[in-house]
């Protein structure tokens, strides 16, 4: 046994719209049915909690009704989606994966995901 | 079931070296995060020091960090909490404490540091 | 630094009586775990994943809440239960997280 290991991209560059997407891969040393996955932001040097969902294998994630994150699951890859981003967002987004069930317990943390984020040009007015 | 045995707590002067041991039993140790939780007489509960299950990455908050080296050696089942330039504000209840599925799952009994001259 | 506010720092309450003690995050946090300590003896995990009760622990607790606000209720007071209660994020990076202050529930 030895700790979980857990992948994902160096860097993404979020839409113009402010959507940012990259998959979490994480190496399962067992069979886990309940997997709980964390997005953190870490700016500087403090680290906060962007969003969190738990789900059963072979189901959907569910965040919260509010939450700017979505997600997916395959197999032991977690495809994220963050949403409304802005230019003050950039930072690294660090996965976080738990295997919560059965036991023993895994936790694995990612090395991050630098996700840059351009605010978009306003439109120049149109002179007709 | 699962077992944290501290030792290695005392008395030490202003400025001196402790050096902290736990023994876990009853569980893969070396699948688990494992820390360190201290409480100074009458206070809360301030976590020092962890380690992921490699003892690749460590973590400290700024209290404690430079001071103090959180170690593991698995194949003992053992952690470790190496202090040094001790003041009198570490004195407190030294806990090693197992970060589970469910926060700090499992807690030893603590051991006693008293820092004084 | 995600901080912890705990309040009341202490809880003068007679056996039978209902007790509600906060936990509020500067920041959003999805879970969160409290934990019991009783004096000269280890903190217990108590509540985890917010409003789970850790393995024996009597159906009179309860925990809820969710982002920067949880609670923790015990619906009628029995003398076991008079201890102190910590809560600590049970999501985000847990080891750059300060545990709260504590709640002292103490008999009236």
């Known amino acids: 046994c030895k700790a979980m290991h857990v992948a994902q991209p160096a860097v993404v560059l979020a839409s113009s719209r402010g959507i940012a997407s990259f998959v979490c891969e994480y190496a399962s040393p067992g069979k886990a049915t309940e997997v709980r996955v964390t997005v953190l932001r870490q700016a500087d040097s403090q680290v906060t909690e962007v969003c969190a969902a738990t789900y059963m294998m072979g189901n959907e994630l569910t965040f919260l009704d509010d939450s700017i994150c979505t997600g997916t699951s395959s197999g032991n890859q977690v495809n994220l989606t963050i949403q409304g981003l802005r230019a003050m967002d950039t930072g690294l987004y660090i996965c976080k994966v738990e295997l919560m069930y059965p036991p023993p317990y895994y936790l694995g943390i990612g090395n991050g995901t630098q996700i840059y984020v351009i605010d978009p040009e306003p439109c120049p007015d149109s002179d007709f | 079931e699962v077992q944290l045995v501290e030792s290695g707590g005392g008395l030490v002067q202003p400025g001196g070296s402790l050096r902290l041991s736990c023994a876990a039993s009853?569980?893969?140790?070396?699948?688990?995060?494992m820390s360190w939780v201290r409480q100074a007489p009458g206070k809360g509960l301030e976590l020092v020091a962890a380690i992921n299950p490699d003892g690749g990455n460590t973590y400290y908050p700024d209290t404690v960090k430079g001071r103090f080296t959180i170690s593991r050696d698995n194949a003992k089942n053992s952690l470790y909490l190496q202090m040094n330039s001790l003041r009198a504000e570490d004195t407190a209840v030294y806990y090693c404490?197992?970060?589970?599925?469910?926060?700090?799952?499992?807690w030893g009994q603590g051991t006693l540091v008293t820092v004084s001259s | 630094e995600n901080v912890l506010t705990q309040s009341p720092a202490t809880l003068s309450l007679s056996p039978g009586e209902r007790a509600t003690l906060s936990c509020s995050a500067s920041?959003?946090?999805?879970?969160m775990h409290w934990y019991q300590q009783k004096p000269g003896q280890a903190p217990r995990l108590w509540i985890y994943?917010?409003?789970k009760l850790a393995s024996g622990i009597p159906a009179r607790f309860s925990g809820s809440g969710s982002r920067n606000d949880y609670t923790l209720t015990i619906s009628s007071l029995e003398p076991e239960d008079f201890a102190v209660y910590y809560c600590?994020?049970?999501?985000?990076?847990?080891?750059?997280?300060?545990f709260g202050g504590g709640t002292k529930v103490e008999i009236k």
């Open positions: 600590f994020p049970g999501s985000g990076f847990p080891f750059m997280y300060t």
């Open positions: 994943d917010t409003s």
């Open positions: 009853g569980f893969t140790f070396n699948i688990y995060y």
């Open positions: 920041s959003s946090v999805s879970y």
């Open positions: 404490a197992r970060y589970g599925g469910p926060g700090f799952d499992s």
